[in-house]
Interface confidence: medium
C-alpha cells in the first residue's frame, strides 16, 4: 500500500486557522517522504496516486518543510500550516520512494481554505400582530464563517425561556406559544462571531384582554 | 379536566435504578413541558429538570446531570423519570409539574421513592 | 444560580391579621417590565398549589385575600385577613433563567 494523507482538523480551515496535513506511509516499505504544493490551478485528479509524470516532475517544485515522525511501523510527515490564507489553497502531494524499486509514489490532496465571512441573517421576523392564546413562529437564520451563533433578546434584554417561550435548532427557531399580554415588546435576533455581529428586529404587538392566563 | 397522574410509591435498593411515570390528560400536553421537582422529607423543593413533550428535548438542573433520565412517551402522554444508582440521598418524594409560563400551574400527587437495602 | 432566601422561615400570625413573607433574590429576576418570580402554597401531604405568577398576578380560583408585590430581587407575599385553612408552607420560585431555584420555604401558623 502507497503513501496516505490526512487532514488535522478532518475539515476545511477557514482563513487564520491552522491545519496540518499528515503523509503516512509504511517505513519498512518506504523513504525519503516529501511534501510538495502543485500550485493554485488544481489538478484533474484530486485525490489518489497520481500519474508517473507528475510525480516525476515534482523535482521542479519547491519542497515544503515538515516535520518527520515515526512510531514503530510508520513514518509521519506533518506539514502544518499555521495561519492558513486563501493562498494556501491547492494540491498538496507527498511524495514516497520504494526503498528497494526506488519507484516514486505520490498521493494528492486538495485543500481548499474557506473565506472568513461576517454574519448575516435571513428569515421571517418582522413585526406582526397576534391575538391572546395564539401562536408566534418565527425563523431567523444566520449565515457566516465561522458559523455565527444565535442568540434572542426582547426589550434589549436576553430571552427567557419557558414552556411558552421556545427556541430550537440552535436557537433558529422562535414559538411564542400561548401568547400573553407580556410577550408584547421589540424581539431581536443577534447571530455573532469573531467577525463581528448581525441583527434583526421585530415588535410583536399582543391584542385581546388577558384571560384567565393559567387555564387551558 | 387538566390532571398529572403519578405512579405509586417506590422501595429501591441502592444502586438499582428508579422509573417514575406521570400521565397527563386533559390538554394539549405536546404544548407544553412537563417538570419534575424533588421534595426531601421535612424539606424544600428542588428543580429537577424539564422535557418538552413535542421533541423530547430536556433541560436538566447540573445537579442532577448523570442522576435523573427524562423521557416522554407521546402515545400515552406519559412523561418518564429514571434516578440511576440512587442513594438514600435520593430518598424524596418527586413531583411532576405541567409548567404554564414558567410557573407551575398543575401538579401530579408525588410519588415516594425509598432508597433502602 | 439564583438563590432565593425567603423570610421570616416561620411566622404565627392570629386569625383576621396579615401575613407578610418575604423572597430575596441574589440577582434581578425582572425583565422587560416584568418580574418572573411565582408562589406557591403547600399544605402536608399535598403537591405545592400555584397562588401567584409574574411577581403579582392572581392564579384562578386562589382567593383575592393572597396579594404579590415586588421587583428586581425584593418580593412579598401578602395574605390578608388570614384564615384557618392558610395555615401551610409558602415557597416563592423563579423563572428567569435555568436552573429555576425554590426559595427555602416560609411556614405560617395561625393563632
Known amino acids: 500500500r502507497g503513501p496516505e494523507i490526512t487532514l488535522q482538523p478532518d475539515m476545511q480551515p477557514t482563513e487564520q486557522e491552522s491545519v496540518s496535513l499528515w503523509c503516512t506511509a509504511d517505513r519498512s516499505t518506504f523513504e525519503n517522504l516529501t511534501w510538495y504544493k502543485l500550485g493554485p490551478q488544481p489538478l484533474p485528479i484530486h485525490v489518489g496516486e497520481l500519474p508517473t509524470p507528475v510525480c516525476k516532475n515534482l523535482d521542479t517544485l519547491w519542497k515544503l518543510n515538515a516535520t518527520m515522525f515515526s512510531n514503530s511501523t510508520n513514518d509521519i510527515l506533518i506539514m502544518e500550516l499555521k495561519n492558513a490564507s486563501l493562498q494556501d489553497q491547492g494540491d498538496y502531494v507527498c511524495l514516497a520512494q520504494d526503498r528497494k524499486t526506488k519507484k516514486r509514489h505520490c498521493v494528492v490532496r486538495q485543500l481548499t481554505v474557506l473565506e472568513r465571512v461576517a454574519p448575516t441573517i435571513t428569515g421571517n421576523l418582522e413585526n406582526q400582530t397576534t391575538s391572546i392564546g395564539e401562536s408566534i413562529e418565527v425563523s431567523c437564520t444566520a449565515s457566516g464563517n465561522p458559523p455565527p451563533q444565535i442568540m434572542w433578546f426582547k426589550d434589549n434584554e436576553t430571552l427567557v425561556e419557558d414552556s411558552g417561550i421556545v427556541l430550537k435548532d440552535g436557537n433558529r427557531n422562535l414559538t411564542i406559544r400561548r401568547v400573553r399580554k407580556e410577550d408584547e415588546g421589540l424581539y431581536t435576533c443577534q447571530a455573532c462571531s469573531v467577525l463581528g455581529c448581525a441583527k434583526v428586529e421585530a415588535f410583536f404587538i399582543i391584542e385581546g384582554a388577558q384571560e384567565k392566563t393559567n387555564l387551558e | 379536566e387538566v390532571q398529572l397522574q403519578q405512579s405509586g410509591p417506590q422501595l429501591v435498593r441502592p444502586g438499582a435504578s428508579a422509573k417514575i411515570s406521570c400521565k397527563a390528560s386533559?390538554?394539549?400536553?405536546?404544548?407544553?413541558?412537563m417538570h419534575w421537582v424533588k421534595q426531601r422529607p421535612g424539606q424544600g423543593l428542588e428543580w429537577i429538570g424539564m422535557?418538552?413533550?413535542?421533541?423530547?428535548?430536556?433541560k436538566l438542573n447540573q445537579r442532577f446531570k448523570g442522576k435523573a433520565t427524562l423521557t416522554v412517551d407521546k402515545s400515552s402522554s406519559t412523561a418518564y423519570m429514571q434516578l440511576s444508582s440512587p442513594t438514600s440521598e435520593d430518598s424524596a418524594v418527586y413531583y411532576c409539574?405541567?409548567?404554564?409560563?414558567?410557573?407551575?400551574?398543575?401538579w401530579g400527587a408525588g410519588t415516594t421513592v425509598t432508597v433502602s437495602s | 444560580d439564583i438563590v432565593l432566601t425567603q423570610s421570616p422561615a416561620s411566622l404565627a400570625v392570629s386569625l383576621g391579621q396579615r401575613a407578610t413573607i418575604s423572597c430575596r433574590a441574589s440577582?434581578?429576576?425582572?425583565?422587560?417590565?416584568?418580574?418572573?418570580m411565582h408562589w406557591y402554597q403547600q399544605k402536608p401531604g399535598q403537591p405545592p398549589k400555584l397562588l401567584i405568577y409574574?411577581?403579582?398576578n392572581l392564579e384562578s380560583g386562589v382567593p383575592a385575600r393572597f396579594s404579590g408585590s415586588g421587583s428586581g430581587t425584593d418580593f412579598t407575599l401578602n395574605i390578608h385577613p388570614v384564615e384557618e385553612e392558610d395555615a401551610a408552607t409558602y415557597y416563592c420560585?423563579?423563572?428567569?433563567?435555568?436552573?429555576?431555584?425554590f426559595g427555602g420555604g416560609t411556614k405560617l401558623e395561625i393563632k
Open positions: 420560585q423563579h423563572s428567569r433563567e435555568l436552573p429555576w431555584t
Open positions: 409574574l411577581a403579582s
Open positions: 440577582k434581578s429576576v425582572s425583565t422587560s417590565g416584568y418580574s418572573y
Open positions: 422535557i418538552d413533550f413535542s421533541d423530547s428535548e430536556t
Open positions: 386533559g390538554y394539549a400536553f405536546t404544548t407544553y413541558w
Open positions: 409539574a405541567r409548567d404554564v409560563r414558567g410557573n407551575f400551574d398543575v
